[in-house]
């Protein structure tokens, strides 16, 4: 077990803070909830603190919760491939570009680390080149979320990881908005981190609303499990 992994044996409170600017539309989001890495479970509620969110909530899911991949459940035989927990408590910087097909792109930079007993994800997001009446600024996405696989590989040069995946957002007309994600994570501290073999995270997310919440918000329930690396030969012959 890495030292960082010991911090995730129980339920951990999570705080998410985002400052965004998409095509000049500025906004802030605050999120709170908890994670339980034993089950790969996240429960979070996000509120736009600046009024109405200028982009659809589903386009921010990867920035919020796929940002705290340290809550992914890594099975026992894969624990040596869990970069995310091994970087804690000092944490990691997570940088992404999200390319939306036939539309603009988001660039994000986040610091994910422990502040006291709370896992904090502080994010800056900049979006450019979006069409004012496109699927994103035109709010044409359905309020739901598909399952995805998130592919992880070691980046030995930067002592971190690279992560690629393609998100499929459902559009109200029945079509799909594709969003290609390119991510890199580098540790904040200078302690040792686990550099993984290639594998993936399997994610399932459910979006809902709080009937008592008047502000623009999103409630998120998510389960994330690491997969893609088989047991070693010694395990097979036990």
């Amino acid at each position: 077990m890495s030292k960082g992994e010991e911090l995730f044996t129980g339920v951990v409170p999570i705080l998410v803070e985002l400052d965004g600017d998409v095509n000049g539309h500025k906004f802030s989001v605050s999120g709170e909830g908890e994670g339980d890495a034993t089950y790969g479970k996240l429960t979070l509620k996000f509120i736009c603190t600046t009024g109405k969110l200028p982009v659809p909530w589903p386009t921010l899911v990867t920035t919020f919760s796929y940002g705290v991949q340290c809550f992914s459940r890594y099975p026992d035989h894969m624990k040596q491939h869990d970069f995310f927990k091994s970087a804690m408590p000092e944490g990691y910087v997570q940088e992404r570009t999200i390319f939306f097909k036939d539309d603009g792109n988001y660039k994000t930079r986040a610091e994910v680390k422990f502040e006291g007993d709370t896992l904090v994800n502080r994010i800056e997001l900049k979006g450019i080149d979006f069409k004012e009446d496109g699927n994103i600024l035109g709010h044409k996405l359905e309020y739901n979320y598909n399952s995805h696989n998130v592919y992880i590989m070691a980046d030995k040069q930067k002592n971190g990881i690279k992560v690629n995946f393609k998100i499929r957002h459902n559009i109200e007309d029945g079509s799909v908005q594709l969003a290609d994600h390119y991510q890199q994570n580098t540790p904040i501290g200078d302690g040792p981190v686990l550099l993984p073999d290639n594998h993936y995270l399997s994610t399932q997310s459910a979006l809902s609303k709080d009937p008592n919440e008047k502000r623009d918000h999103m409630v998120l329930l998510e389960f994330v499990t690491a997969a893609g690396i088989t047991h070693g030969m010694d395990e097979l012959y036990k």
Partner: nanobody, 117 residues
Amino acid sequence: ESGGGSVQAGGSLKLSCAASGYISSNCMGWFRQAPGKEREGVASIYRGYGNTYYTDSVKGRFTISQDNAKNTIYLQMNSLKPEDTARYYCAAVNCARWPFDREYNYWGQGTQVTVSS
């Protein structure tokens, strides 16, 4: 890289870059270096969907494009100015830190562009 040359102000040139497997990436960019100056990013393209980015000084004048079948990136330069004089390079870009963070510590020979007034 190829396609450079000498041209009068207001003229046009089209640069091309055949990206070999070694330096190829899903994101590619054009960079330039004028004598005595730092190398700077000019334009970048995401090859998956064709998303593009331009530095302010070339917006509306330069166009980056691609031919996926030929694994080639182009830079169409119109309304050239003397301040565009530089050696131009194409390079693989780190998509996560798009538009101008290089993927590899490697530069090609580049192609010289000279714009006279």
